[in-house]
Amino acid sequence: QFPRQCATVEALRSGMCCPDLSPVSGPGTDRCGSSSGRGRCEAVTADSRPHSPQYPHDGRDDREVWPLRFFNRTCHCNGNFSGHNCGTCRPGWRGAACDQRVLIVRRNLLDLSKEEKNHFVRALDMAKRTTHPLFVIATRRSEEILGPDGNTPQFENISIYNYFVWTHYYSVKKTFLGVGQESFGEVDFSHEGPAFLTWHRYHLLRLEKDMQEMLQEPSFSLPYWNFATGKNVCDICTDDLMGSRSNFDSTLISPNSVFSQWRVVCDSLEDYDTLGTLCNSTEDGPIRRNPAGNVARPMVQRLPEPQDVAQCLEVGLFDTPPFYSNSTNSFRNTVEGYSDPTGKYDPAVRSLHNLAHLFLNGTGGQTHLSPNDPIFVLLHTFTDAVFDEWLRRYNADISTFPLENAPIGHNRQYNMVPFWPPVTNTEMFVTAPDNLGYTYEIQWPSREFSVPE
């Protein structure tokens, strides 16, 4: 959400979040690394183009024209400098001058060595237990952000992994319209629209960067789960990886897995929607997971087929009107899983990304909670790999990513909610190896053509 240095009365009242980098002569003397030419404190650029009419509550939600309800000045970094105070480098660059390129490799979790698997699991568990060194989360909406006395900022520390969960929750939560009024649920800043892939791409990139810093390991990368196996079993649900099924309760994770000890955040939806509070850092119950166990919905008891990926990659338009979950011939809607793998919209269909979530049949299948199950990370790195292959094949053709009239939050130039510093969808609509410093080690299935008789 926001850097700890900006969660202050002064910063919130002034609307300026431009922290110092190396203040030699007192506070405010090196905002955004200005003394070393890294950046400047400038007005925030926020998308003001119209969104689609399905959101009728303009003025009622802090996520509108993000992040202007909180801050109107932030750091604009020069060249390859980046970060809340221009103290880091843009993805794919490193060094004191951010002038050296690096490329990390995201690999199939099942292809890792025993030591690498163990390292990844331990790293996730460390991220679950480690307070985020930079960001704090708001526990109240902007009108209550300074507390009942108007002088106590309502922010909390949160762990690196729970921050990853919280940002997703904040992007999908309902719009609170007041005590006694039903919250408005037909809003989602990270799903059911063109920003789905770009939002989740940045979401993963932030976690990966946070874990690299936590481990002091610049080569650390998030692996992926190739969920397009066509099977009715979860091949990564073993105790050396993401945890097998508990023998005591088929909806829980085996006690032999560290993930059985994890507790979820952002589960008190009733409170958030009726009281207008926000998810805080309090952990509740365990992760629930019952792969292929939803007997009431047989269509979600089997994972997507390898051919589904090959087919979706042949959908050449990134998105199509109405740029929503009922778009046809939209690559985004197809990989998100509201259309069938050929691109045809069908309200009964749940394919690819959506099917993988629903297959997990538990925490990972509930949108506001899903990142609490760490399989989310692996599911989304694979989804991002598909996205990156599409960008490669179609030369990152952004022409069908709408500049306006997409669902709120989904316009091309919208700052993705609630990331900081502000980052637009456009910035993530690029091939990863050339622009974002990572690549996938992956082989794509080729489409098998049947010869007509």
Epitope: R94, G95, A96, Q100, V102, H119, Q216, P218
Partner: antibody, heavy 121, light 107 residues
């Protein structure tokens, strides 16, 4: 100025444990990761692991996993390295050293004077 | 794990000579590499970080170069006080392994 002062030499029997301390001054240990490196007599340097004193996180080299424990006491600016189930091959000088992570700097820039641990029956 | 291989293991050179020590990584480590000098009976001392940046207080006759898998430490004009063992270390992926060392002597 930056200093890392380690505890004195130790003689231990095989199977025992040793705990080496490293007291930092001239900088805030919460702002740095502290690494441990050892050197057997006449041999090269061997990286053992690191601790982040700010939160207690540790990463150990696979070779030492299960035998080494690194801890920190920020109130006294001291880090500790405990090695258990000692064997003769653990006879070495143990160094504590710090890494400045600014811009991911690839270096261990200040080193303690070293602690000789001798394992002998 | 990335292995670091130094060559030569030992070398003898005359005062004033240009001396080159190489370090090869088993995988691409970009420029996440440091060089250290350890004089007999002393503590290792940082010479070079980020493959080519001279640490504070290190004489300018020392320099580092290379990126990716092949790195070089050069002493432009060998001095008697440079007798030591030199080590490289990478910081790209865990564990942060050292090279086996290069022992430098004066002829």
């Amino acid at each position: 100025q930056v200093q890392l002062v380690q505890s004195g030499a130790e003689v231990k029997k095989p199977g025992a444990s040793v705990k080496v301390s490293c007291k930092a001054s001239g900088f805030n240990i919460k702002d740095y990761f502290l690494h441990w490196v050892r050197q057997a007599p006449g041999q090269g340097l061997e990286w053992m692991g690191w601790i982040n004193p700010d939160n207690g996180n540790t990463v150990y080299a696979q070779k030492f996993q299960g035998r080494v424990t690194m801890t920190a006491d920020t109130s006294t600016s001291t880090v500790y390295m405990e090695l258990s189930s000692l064997r003769s091959e653990d006879t070495a000088v143990y160094y504590c050293t710090r890494r400045d992570y600014t811009y991911e700097k690839a270096a261990l820039d200040y080193w303690g004077q070293g602690t000789l641990v001798t394992v002998s029956s | 794990d990335i292995q670091m291989t130094q060559s030569p293991s030992s070398l003898s050179a005359s005062v004033g000579d240009r001396v080159t020590i190489t370090c090869r990584a088993s995988g691409n480590i970009y420029n996440y590499l440091a060089w250290y000098q350890q004089k007999p009976g002393k503590v290792p001392k940082l010479l070079i970080y980020d493959a080519k940046t001279l640490a504070d207080g290190v004489p300018s006759r020392f320099s580092g170069s290379g990126s990716g898998t092949d790195f070089t430490l050069t002493i432009s004009s060998l001095q008697p006080e440079d007798v030591a063992t030199y080590y490289c270390q990478h910081f790209w992926s865990l564990p942060f392994t050292f090279g086996q060392g290069t022992k430098l002597e004066i002829k």
